[in-house]
């Protein structure tokens, strides 16, 4: 039997009778949040053999071992993945071992196994036989291995029982649990699966089979199932189903969508067969079942059942997120916020029709109205008194409309109407009737030219730079001196820059009244000497990174209610040079044969320019007479050697560890203090996992489908 | 012993401002979701916020979302409700209680409130 | 949201009385429901979680059963402790909501 489209068992173990008849699980399988600490003993799901998902176990109290409860699963398919994990073993408080011993392969994804207070058989698991890249497995906070004492079938005897292999430089034996090896497939079977007594599966299968050579005795397909056979691709006619199976157009017209009653039914696209069209798609006509390429952004029409919509905050804002088409008004009141124009943006930033009228009042958190970064029509079916179809009223901060030079905005009904904005120029104002079509529609008053602007220097004379000098982290860069009429008016410069990866960025992004910025800031004083050009050293900058910079002058804006002039340069794109990588990262070496070796490595964090090439340097190294000095049959004479695994838990290190001892008079050693990037690493490391826990605590208490 | 405490209540003016603190004892304060929970006179529970163990998610009831803000801090042991814009219906008794470890939203340890 | 109705809001009861208090949701909630006592001038207290499962150091005469959308809270034999205003609680999904409360005085 196919179950799904997801399993969730929570808060009563008796919900695992569920899984009586699954053979398969198409979707997930979580098992969390169970308090009563039951014998499982008597719960045993032999059918169960592959997972299209991930498995999330999470607060079981007394499950020990998951090898009785699925002795055969197989295969973890990964096919959609839990913050990247296909397995996920999270704060299991008895569990000893994971003993899955049947596990042959974990198609995608990766695993995370943390906070297990009492599991151990971590180690003598080899993961690199289940999954194709364990480097960004996650295993940590479990119990230390030296109290593990982990133990493989028959090395107490001397008989050992278990194959071996290297991790991390320890050839050992690779077992799940203290009676269960962890199966291998000959090394004649390359990477097919393989039967119970070591004859090669087809290659279609996965995991394993139950006969050699044939592609119908297969416990799990490498690509797709189609009436008992695993195959390459679907036959014609037949669809690509949830990653794992082939099915017919009836099938997939008939599925009822987990998600919600109400939606339109499944789509077939690209020969899969899916809930939704994908990214860039949408639906040929509400009831069909294919999909077609979106003109630009796929439209989202989202509607007010009050007409008026009120963005207030950050949380009202996020209703329209993904919205193309807002079918009613905008009201944006928006006096307070952190981070509120790109938080806006990021919600509101897709709209591009507005039906009705849009107001912006006492929004005095706003510095500009970019964060509309796709408005290209405003309606204005329904109108505020007065026909004003476009109203701005009291926005102390308020200095930019858009950016008129890269946007068509059309009003296509009613009035703009203007008032209170102390920080906007009226010239702004008369571009924005120009570029919206709406110049001759608004009567005297509607654009008041006495109290917007009227503190703001709004005749901008243009500062040009003079020169500029790069390094590899930092950039000379000097003006001409700016001489308004009145030398007095002007009290010194302001210098922003940011990093600017592409050349599109303008004065207001990111930018709010409330403090954020994604700009930088340096204050630079007038020169004493008249006759010398203002410059400014910028320094701590990234090598080989383009940055944005520009330059304001500072001037008293006000001299007896005339408006005075202003002056700013244009941006400026400037990159420093380039510079020494860092260090290539995950630099992994293996022997396959006698005489080669095979290296590889992942490019560094940070290229600091165009990298044309790598060099690799070896040498040999004499024979360590270390190796020869043991009697490596016998298990308690074998010399502990410590490999650093790369992880530190935090919360578990409480002193400082003893080192060595210095001898003379001079004691213990305490250890080396961090480096820097240490350091850094450790923080990462602790945000990381606060990230996760986030991710888990947030997936797992959420509103249920009803 | 297991152990919530409240502080912070008190007399304020409609649209101002109070913080409430829950100092907790007794448990690993890091492991568990909180809750705030509030009682007018003379009236039945009401859930107000709730905080889940890692401290990255946080919900709502819809009478006080966007007014109010639950936050922890692990190293002190405490959680907080920050309350903006209060309302004349906000008055009540705010109690804290901690959510069960297996049982998400059953609240198993209460503080003894604050006014 | 899911609304949750106690029924009765108040009874009268003697000691050694049989106690039967119910609670309906608005839609199902599985067995995602809580019961609490409250006595006046004090912090609720967990009886039941899980429909049907005693917290700890919650006396035997207090049962809970029901799933979906219909629960009960039995007393089997009022004691003196035991008068007090009782509430059930879903958390099946988010908003969290109680029921308006069943008062239990003694007759």
């Known amino acids: 039997e196919i179950c799904g489209p997801g399993i969730d068992i929570r808060n009563d173990y008796q919900q695992l009778k569920r899984l009586e008849n699954c053979t398969v699980i198409e979707g997930y399988l979580h098992i969390l949040l169970i308090s009563k600490a039951e014998d499982y003993r008597s719960y045993r799901f032999p059918k169960l053999t592959v997972i299209t998902e991930y498995l999330l176990l999470f607060r079981v109290a007394g499950l020990e071992s998951l090898g009785d409860l699925f002795p055969n699963l197989t295969v973890i398919r990964g096919w959609k993945l839990f913050y990247n994990y296909a397995l996920v073993i999270f704060e299991m408080t008895n569990l000893k071992d994971i003993g899955l011993y049947n596990l042959r392969n974990i198609t995608r994804g990766a695993i995370r196994i943390e906070k297990n207070a009492d599991l151990c058989y971590l180690s003598t698991v080899d993961w690199s036989l289940i999954l194709d890249a364990v480097s960004n497995n996650y295993i940590v906070g479990n119990k230390p291995p030296k109290e593990c004492g982990d133990l493989c079938p028959g090395t107490m005897e001397e008989k050992p029982m278990c194959e071996k292999t290297t991790i991390n430089n320890e050839y050992n034996y690779r077992c799940w649990t203290t009676n269960r090896c962890q199966k291998m497939c000959p090394s004649t079977c390359g990477k097919r699966a393989c039967t119970e007594n070591n004859e090669c599966c087809h290659p279609e299968c996965l995991g394993s089979c139950s006969a050699p050579d044939n592609d119908t005795a297969c416990v799990a397909c490498r690509h797709y199932y189609y009436a008992g056979v695993c195959v390459p691709a679907c036959p014609p006619n037949t669809y690509r189903f949830e990653g794992w199976r082939c099915v017919d157009r009836d099938f997939c017209a008939n599925i009822l969508s987990a998600e919600s009653s109400d939606s339109e039914g499944f789509v077939i696209h690209d020969g899969e067969c899916m809930q939704e069209c994908p990214s860039g798609f949408i639906r040929n006509g509400s009831q069909s079942m294919y999909c077609i390429p979106c003109e630009g952004p796929c439209p989202k029409v989202c509607e007010e059942e009050k007409k008026t919509k009120t963005i207030d905050s950050v949380t009202s804002a996020q209703m329209l997120q993904g919205c193309t088409i807002f079918k009613g008004n905008l009201l944006i009141n928006i006096r307070r916020g952190n981070n509120i124009a790109s938080e806006l943006e990021n919600f509101m930033g897709l709209i591009e029709v507005v039906t009705g009228y849009v107001k912006i009042r006492h929004s005095h958190a706003l510095v500009s109205l970019s964060f509309l970064k796709n408005l290209r029509l405003i309606l204005g079916e329904e109108q505020l008194e007065g026909n004003y179809s476009f109203y701005v009223l009291d926005n102390q901060n308020l200095q930019q409309l858009w950016d008129w030079d890269h946007r068509n905005l059309t009003i296509k009904a009613g009035k703009m109407y203007f008032a209170f904005n102390p920080k906007l120029c009226v010239s702004e104002i008369y571009r924005m009737e120009e570029v919206t079509g709406t110049k001759g529609r608004q009567s005297k008053g509607d654009i008041n030219t006495r109290n917007n602007g009227e503190r703001a220097s709004c005749e901008s004379d243009v500062l040009h730079f003079t020169s500029t000098t790069t390094s590899k982290n930092r950039i000379i860069i000097t003006w001409h001196r700016y001489r308004p009429p009145d030398y007095r008016d002007l009290i010194s410069f302001t210098v922003y820059y940011k990093e600017a990866p592409f050349k599109n960025v303008t004065e207001y992004d990111g930018q709010d009244a409330c403090g954020s910025n994604s700009w930088n800031m340096v204050d630079v004083d007038l020169p004493p000497n008249k006759d010398v050009e203002p410059g400014i050293l910028l320094h701590g900058l990234k090598p080989w990174t383009q940055y944005a910079v520009y330059v304001k002058a500072v001037t008293l804006t006000m001299v007896e209610n005339d408006h005075i002039r202003g002056a700013k340069s244009e941006i400026l794109y400037i990159r420093t040079n380039a510079s020494v990588p860092s260090i290539p990262l995950d630099v992994l070496s293996a022997s396959n044969s006698s005489s080669q070796l095979i290296v590889k490595w992942n490019p560094p964090s940070l290229p600091n320019g165009n990298l044309s090439y790598y060099i690799v340097r070896w040498q040999r190294q004499p024979q360590d007479g270390y190796l020869y000095r043991h009697n490596y049959c016998s298990k308690d004479k074998i010399p502990i050697r410590k490999y650093a695994d790369g992880t530190i838990d935090i919360e578990e290190v409480t002193e400082n560890p003893k080192t060595e001892v210095c001898g003379g008079e001079k004691g213990p050693c305490c250890a080396c203090p961090k480096t820097e990037a240490e350091k850094q690493a450790e923080k990462e490391e602790a945000e990381y996992r606060k990230v996760f826990e986030n991710f888990l605590h947030n997936s797992i208490f959420v509103p249920r489908p009803e | 012993e297991v152990q919530l405490v409240e502080s912070g209540g008190g007399l304020v003016q409609p649209g101002g401002s109070l913080r409430l603190s829950c100092a907790a004892s007794?448990?690993?304060?890091?492991?568990?979701?909180m809750s705030w929970v509030r009682q007018a006179p003379g009236k039945g529970l009401e859930w107000v916020s709730r905080i889940s163990p890692s401290g990255g998610s946080t919900y709502y009831a819809d009478s006080v979302k966007g007014r109010f803000t639950i936050s922890a801090d692990t190293s002190k042991n405490t959680a907080y409700l920050q309350m903006n814009s209060l309302r004349a219906e906000d008055t009540a008794v705010y109690y804290c209680?901690?959510?069960?470890?297996?049982?998400?939203?059953?609240?198993?340890?209460w503080g003894q409130g604050t006014l | 949201d899911i609304q949750m109705t106690q029924s009765p809001s108040s009874l009268s009861a003697s000691v050694g009385d049989r106690v039967t208090i119910t609670c309906r949701a608005s839609q199902s909630i599985s067995s995602y429901l809580a019961w609490y006592q409250q006595k006046p001038g004090k912090a609720p207290k967990l009886l039941i979680y899980g429909a049907s499962s005693r917290a700890s150091g919650v006396p035997s005469r207090f049962s809970g059963s029901g799933s979906g959308t219909d629960f009960t809270l039995t007393i089997s034999s009022l004691q003196p402790e035991d008068f007090a205003t009782y509430y059930c609680q879903q958390y099946y999904s988010s908003p969290l909501t109680f029921g308006q409360g069943t008062k239990v005085e003694i007759k």
């Open positions: 209680a901690r959510e069960s470890y297996y049982e998400w939203g059953a609240m198993d340890v």
């Open positions: 007794g448990f690993t304060f890091s492991s568990y979701a």
